[in-house]
């Protein structure tokens, strides 16, 4: 008949498994339980995937691996008496008197429960990596952490290459023995030890679980070190950069940590496994029973088959590893799980021109000299689209793309952002808001919903803020409805008249040029260059100023650049910014200074795009280490990442305006990176590409 083969990872566990099998058999529990010996949890997962075993209980990290790599699913969860249902929370604790936040952890002293422990290491390190605060090059997480904190106590890190930094705060026992041991010999080991490390002032932050502070303060702890501690003297660090009272752990934590769970193959009936174990726990989980499912004492070990603290097993409703782990823990695991053995030795960068090939070659050499990993290789392609095709086909790994290309790369080729460019705050030409500017006019005021029949001024056909975003947004919102994919005609029929300068027109609707004025002699009307006085963002604003148009679609800085004395040309010299307003998507009007809240979209910075199976943290980790050496345009290290002047080109590999490469943080998809409004505008336009 039917049988369930449990996978044991050690001799003691095999022993307990045999006893459980025997107890179940004697009690007549069906199906019968057999035991298979594996060498480790990883090995057991492989055995289950290969149909040589059926079930094992795993912790969160292993559930993630088993689900992601082998398609296993969790079907039965553990519940612990003292915990919060089937989970507990990983928190970061600081002294109330300090000024540390989650955003200022770099350089502070840190206390951890132990190397590779869930709340003391896996969750905080994974979270810091995943959120982009901690960059890891070449999967060397230990090095990254040792460089990031200003000294730590990570019990168990003594055997690593970075023990000087990772064990710097550890103290051992009262006689100085067992420094940095992953055992009670180290006074700063485990939850209470990590908290003690913080409380005694050795560290500035402790990574512990939600109950640790309350269990070790306000007179609840016996050891002398904790007697006088008050819970009110400590606070939690929240993910949003704020801090909260230690009782607020449900709202303020790094991640909810899932309980251990029994995993099986996707084709195994989870209900059957639960019924088997439920029968077992009904008979074998209380004090006097002949076999103790949730105790390992008899075998001289802890947590065999199940955690000893398990109070009951419950069925899992949504049997996917993602649902069980929850998005917070899932994200932390993504940041942490980086196997150096599976890291490709090269990152193949897509290049589009001879100057770019030259710069890329120099970058590869410069990175190699500094032993940066993975090494750069340069691969040519004919166009951004060709790059996307080659990345999808696994012939290339990465390319930097602009907003519209990011949209195509994500939507059509399934690529994701791995790192982004960041420009100077005052640099409005590379990342900016698209706004609709109107004259302040109380008697004839209209809103964005009332643009039909108005006169419009645009920087030029195909310009992001002048055409693509506003027209895309109006299509997406249903105001402009192109027939037969003819956007130009639809726009020409929507507005009463427009100025949309264009190069090499064909069949261009005349009304899109009706407001254009050409040069001083009246020639070159509507041409896509500065001979047309209403061309470009400045020209579009001038079209509004001179009353040719009722609305101008421009950048958020255009009004400021051409008013209040910032432009001395006769048409602009006397203009005041307060005479103009913005039209907002919600139907309101706003001051021109309110562009961040009242805009059609933000034009996103360029981003490095990769396949979804590429480890984005290693890509950012490489770029982050590289920019420390080569990011400054005045560096003396022989290569300038963000400067193309040596190659007789511009914006090669990265935009020259880039100040630094930044992590994508939570913007892990093309839609997240581009922003909803920009995507909506592009979708409006792309819906017309027939």
């Amino acid at each position: 008949g039917m049988e369930v083969r449990w996978c044991a990872t050690s001799d003691p566990e095999q022993h307990k498994c045999g006893n459980m099998s025997e107890a179940f058999r004697e009690a007549g529990i069906q199906p019968s339980l057999l035991c298979v010996r594996g060498t480790s949890a990883d090995h057991c997962v492989q055995l289950i995937a290969a149909q040589e075993a059926d079930a094992i209980t795993l912790d969160g990290g292993a559930i993630y691996e088993a689900g992601k790599e082998h398609g296993l699913k969790p079907v039965v969860g553990e519940v612990y008496d003292q915990e919060v249902g089937t989970s507990y929370y990983a928190v970061a604790v600081v002294r109330r008197s300090s000024h540390v936040t989650i955003d200022t952890l770099k350089g502070v002293k840190s206390c951890h429960t132990g190397i590779n422990r869930t709340v003391g290491w896996n969750v905080p390190v994974g979270y810091l990596v995943e959120s982009g605060r901690l960059s890891v090059m070449g999967c060397d997480v230990l090095k990254a952490v040792s460089d990031y904190f200003g000294g730590s106590c990570v019990p168990g890190a003594g055997e690593t290459s970075y023990s000087e930094s990772l064990c710097r705060l550890c103290r051992g026992d009262s006689s100085g023995e067992g420094v940095c041991d992953k055992s009670p010999l180290e006074r700063y080991y485990d939850y209470s030890g990590a908290f003690r490390c913080l409380a005694e002032g050795a560290g500035d932050v402790a990574f512990v679980k939600h109950s640790t502070v309350l269990e070790n303060t306000d007179g609840k702890t016996l050891p002398s070190w904790g007697q006088a501690l008050l819970s009110q003297d400590f606070e939690l660090l929240c993910r949003d950069g704020s801090r909260a009272d230690v009782t607020e752990w449900r709202q303020c934590h790094l991640a909810r940590v899932p309980a251990h769970a029994v995993v099986v193959r996707a084709d195994t009936d989870g209900g059957l496994i639960f019924r088997l174990l439920n029968e077992g726990q009904r008979l074998f989980s209380h004090e006097g029973s002949s076999f103790q499912m949730f105790s390992s004492e008899a075998y001289g070990q802890k947590d065999l088959l199940f955690k000893d603290s398990t109070s009951e097993l419950v069925p899992i409703a949504t049997q996917t590893y993602e649902a069980w782990l929850g998005h917070e823990y899932l994200h932390a695991m993504k940041g942490l799980l980086c196997d150096p053995n599976r890291l490709p030795p090269y990152l193949r960068w897509c290049v589009l021109s001879t100057p770019e090939i030259q710069k890329c070659g120099d970058m590869a050499v410069a990175f190699r000299r500094q032993r940066l990993k993975p090494e750069i290789q340069c691969v040519s392609a004919k166009s951004p689209q060709h790059c996307m095709e080659r990345i999808q086909a696994e012939q290339v790994d990465a390319v930097t793309l602009s907003g519209e290309d990011i949209y195509t790369a994500g939507k059509t080729y399934g690529l994701v952002p791995a790192a982004g460019e960041h420009y100077a705050p005052e640099d409005s030409s590379n990342s900016y808001y698209v706004v609709a500017v109107v004259r302040r006019d109380s008697s004839h005021a209209f809103t964005l919903d009332e643009l039909r029949g108005k006169r419009s001024c645009h920087a030029g056909f195909g310009s992001p803020a002048g055409w693509d975003v506003p027209v895309g947004a109006l299509i997406q919102r249903g105001f402009i409805r192109p027939k037969d994919c003819d956007v130009l005609t639809a726009v020409s029929e929507f507005f009463n008249a427009s100025c949309v300068p264009v190069n090499n027109p064909k069949n261009y609707p005349s009304s899109l040029c009706a407001l254009c004025v050409g040069d001083e002699q009246g020639r070159n009307k509507c041409v896509g260059n500065s001979q047309e006085r209403y061309y470009g963002y400045r020209g579009a604003f001038r079209c509004l100023v001179e009353n040719a148009g009722d609305v101008a679609f421009v950048r958020h800085t255009t009004v400021f650049d051409n008013t209040n004395g910032h432009n001395s040309e006769p048409w602009a010299a006397e203009l005041r910014s307060e005479d103009y307003e913005l039209l907002c998507p919600n139907g309101a009007r706003a001051e021109v200074s309110q562009f961040a809240a009242c805009n059609l979209a933000q034009i996103p910075p360029h981003a490095v795009m990769v396949r979804p199976d590429t480890n984005i943290f290693t890509v950012y980790g490489l770029l982050d280490k590289a920019q420390d050496l080569f990011g400054d345009d005045h560096n003396k290290n022989g290569f300038k990442m963000f400067d193309s002047s040596n190659y007789h080109g511009q914006d090669l590999l990265f935009k020259d305006a880039t100040v630094r490469a930044v992590p994508v943080g939570e913007k892990t998809t093309y839609r997240g990176w581009l922003g909803l409004d920009y995507v909506a505008a592009l979708e409006g336009m792309s819906s017309q590409q027939c």
């Epitope: 037969d484 064909k506 069949n507 261009y508 005349s510 009304s511 009706a514």
Partner: antibody, heavy 118, light 107 residues
Framework: EVQLVQSGAEVKKPGESLKISCKGS????????LHWVRQMPGKGLEWMGR????????SYNQIFKDQVTISADKSISTAYLQWSSLKASDTAMYYC???????????WGQGTTVTVSS | DIQMTQSPSSLSASVGDRVTITCKAS??????VAWYQQKPGKAPKLLIY???TRHAGVPSRFSGSGSGTDFTLTISSLQPEDFATYYC?????????FGQGTKVEIK
């Protein structure tokens, strides 16, 4: 050089159907609109409608909307104007004209005379 | 639809004369007006668009002006080959509409 060559003169009876043609050469046929314009004997010019040969999208003057059909076959660079049932009042010269930079007639064919008489 | 009214409907002039034809639109068409020349038995030829922009190959004696609703075609010095019928057309909104034509005859 841009050339639009129209089919020859037609003499038809009322109620008959007719299809006249206009073949474009010297340019990429699908790049520009093709318009049809009517000129009745001794009268002025009337725009009938246009077609985008690239996707066969049409736009008609309401006066002519249910009277004629404009079509195109891009494989042979030819546009057509057809009637399913001619009337005496359809007697006229019909011109095809190609668009240019802008979306109105720039270059004209030599015209096709259509005579409808019982 | 936008109506285009041309005047005069015909005029007689001699070679070398300066000739002016006017066209009035029933509503504001900005500068979106074209002028065509048609000789007997021939197809029309585009002379001017955007009220004042000469089409390629059109002699400089032809010029146009105007915006809004009032437009003018001027032939600065009439040549023998200029005797023809001239039509204005608005290219602001479909349906494109033409004036009824002005016939320039030899005096």
């Amino acid at each position: 050089e841009v050339q639009l060559v129209q089919s020859g003169a037609e003499v038809k009876k009322p109620g008959e159907s007719l299809k006249i043609s206009c073949k474009g050469s010297g340019y990429s046929f699908t790049d520009y609109y093709l318009h049809w314009v009517r000129q009745m004997p001794g009268k002025g010019l009337e725009w009938m409608g246009r077609i985008n040969p690239y996707n066969a999208a049409t736009s008609y003057n309401q006066i002519f909307k249910d009277q004629v059909t404009i079509s195109a076959d891009k494989s042979i660079s030819t546009a057509y104007l057809q009637w399913s049932s001619l009337k005496a009042s359809d007697t006229a010269m019909y011109y095809c004209a190609r668009g240019g930079d802008y979306d109105f007639p720039w270059y004209w064919g030599q015209g096709t005379t259509v005579t409808v008489s019982s | 639809d936008i109506q285009m009214t041309q005047s005069p409907s015909s005029l007689s002039a001699s070679v070398g004369d300066r000739v002016t034809i006017t066209c009035k639109a029933s509503q504001d068409v900005y500068a979106a007006v074209a002028w065509y020349q048609q000789k007997p038995g021939k197809a029309p030829k585009l002379l001017i668009y955007w009220a004042s922009t000469r089409h390629a190959g059109v002699p400089s004696r032809f010029s146009g002006s105007g915006s809004g609703t009032d437009f003018t075609l001027t032939i600065s010095s009439l040549q023998p080959e200029d005797f023809a019928t001239y039509y204005c057309q608005q290219h602001y909104r479909t349906p494109w509409t033409f004036g009824q034509g002005t016939k320039v005859e030899i005096k």
